[in-house]
Amino acid sequence: AGSDSLYVPCAPSPCVNGGTCRQTGDFTFECNCLPGFEGSTCERNIDDCPNHRCQNGGVCVDGVNTYNCRCPPQWTGQFCTEDVDECLLQPNACQNGGTCANRNGGYGCVCVNGWSGDDCSENIDDCAFASCTPGSTCIDRVASFSCMCPEGKAGLLCHLDDACISNPCHKGALCDTNPLNGQYICTCPQGYKGADCTEDVDEGNSHHHHHH
């Protein structure tokens, strides 16, 4: 039965993954494995991850006689050692005119006046620090605020008494309050002049404004 079915250990080679077969006896062989493989026929890829050096939160992925790192979004490079420049990647990372500043492992926004938050999307509530007089209503604006005054009060902060309350303007004149000093301003109808619109004027002159 013998000679027609002679077993030749290395023909064909049982070594896989590029391993080289060497006959060591009539029925025995040895595989010399390429780096990164082990086993009697070089069938196992050696796990290189136990000795990995993935940095900055990178996760090891085994390769052949090496390893690779799967990096978090803020990092790149073979070992996650290179900082991603989010400011280049996302030109609109900072909103409302904010300036993007790249940092190791992230980025920050330097917001323009009136805006806050990680991406400058939050309008700062200026009313939180406003000094509108009690009884008035604060309205938040971008980097500013305005005070809505109750009847009888005037001025930017509603801290002045409204001079128009006493109806100082005569002859159907319009009364406005100067927001800086609270004094009244009369806009006289045609034919009248003076601080209170009590004086007649020559024909030909139209509306007059008088401050008091």
């Epitope: 780096p35 290189d48 136990p50 000795n51 990995h52 050096r53 993935c54 940095q55 900055n56 939160g57 990178g58 090496t66 390893y67 978090p72 073979q78 070992f79 050692t81 190791n104």
Partner: antibody, heavy 120, light 107 residues
Framework: EVQLVESGGGLVQPGGSLKLSCAVS????????MEWIRQASGKGLEWIAA??????????VYSASVKDRFTISRDTSKSTLYLQMNSLKTEDTAVYYC???????????WGQGTLVTVSS | DIQMTQSPSSVSASVGDRVTITCQTS??????LAWYQQKPGKSPKLLIY???RLQDGVPSRFSGSGSGTDYTLTISSLQPEDFATYYC?????????FGGGTKVEIK
């Protein structure tokens, strides 16, 4: 400012034990790999143990020369790295440094070192 | 383990000289190489990481180059404070390994 300060070194007999501490400050301790390196008098640097960061589950690696004898650990609440050394041998005599692996495959901050002498 | 062969083991040089130290690794470390300076009684200090990147605060006379298995540290113009021992270290995988050191001495 990043600072690492080792303590706990001293004279110990062969077969004895010693626990080294490394108090750290100036950085988020759990974010970094930490290493222990030693240097025998007049010799070169020898890495002996590492603990990876929180993102890597604080996993641990040892050199063959200290495996099963030394234990690296950290207490994040105390910002302290430790090296428990058991079954000490005369060849363990060295200055022991703790160092921070700065996220660039390099050791960017080192302590001042603490001397361990194993002698009878 | 990755073997590190650093040469020369010592070099005598004068202030102003250009000094070159080489480090060869037993396998490709993908530029994961660092260089350190150590003075007597002091801790090592990181000079170069990633084979060629200068650590913050390190003078520009120090430079690193190389890839694969061959790396070089160059001091372009030696200064009095540069007399020390220099070590290379691979950071590609554990165990971390160091070169044997190069002592730069005054000629």
């Amino acid at each position: 400012e990043v600072q690492l300060v080792e303590s706990g070194g001293g004279l110990v007999q062969p077969g004895g034990s010693l626990k080294l501490s490394c108090a750290v400050s100036g950085f988020t301790f759990s974010d970094f790999y930490m290493e222990w390196i030693r240097q025998a008098s007049g010799k070169g640097l020898e890495w002996i143990a590492a603990q990876r960061n929180k993102a890597n589950d604080f996993s641990i690696v040892y050199s063959a020369s200290v495996k099963d004898r030394f234990t690296i650990s950290r207490d994040t609440s105390k910002s302290t790295l430790y090296l428990q050394m058991n079954s000490l041998k005369t060849e363990d005599t060295a200055v022991y440094y703790c160092s921070r692996d700065g996220g660039k495959l390099a050791l960017d901050a080192w302590g001042q070192g603490t001397l361990v002498t194993v002698s009878s | 383990d990755i073997q590190m062969t650093q040469s020369p083991s010592s070099v005598s040089a004068s202030v102003g000289d250009r000094v070159t130290i080489t480090c060869q690794t037993s396998e490709d470390i993908y530029s994961g190489l660092a260089w350190y300076q150590q003075k007597p009684g002091k801790s090592p200090k990181l000079l170069i990481y990633g084979a060629s990147r200068l650590q913050d605060g390190v003078p520009s006379r120090f430079s690193g180059s190389g890839s694969g298995t061959d790396y070089t540290l160059t001091i372009s113009s030696l200064q009095p404070e540069d007399f020390a021992t220099y070590y290379c270290q691979q950071g590609f995988k554990y165990p971390l390994t160091f070169g044997g050191g190069t002592k730069v001495e005054i000629k």
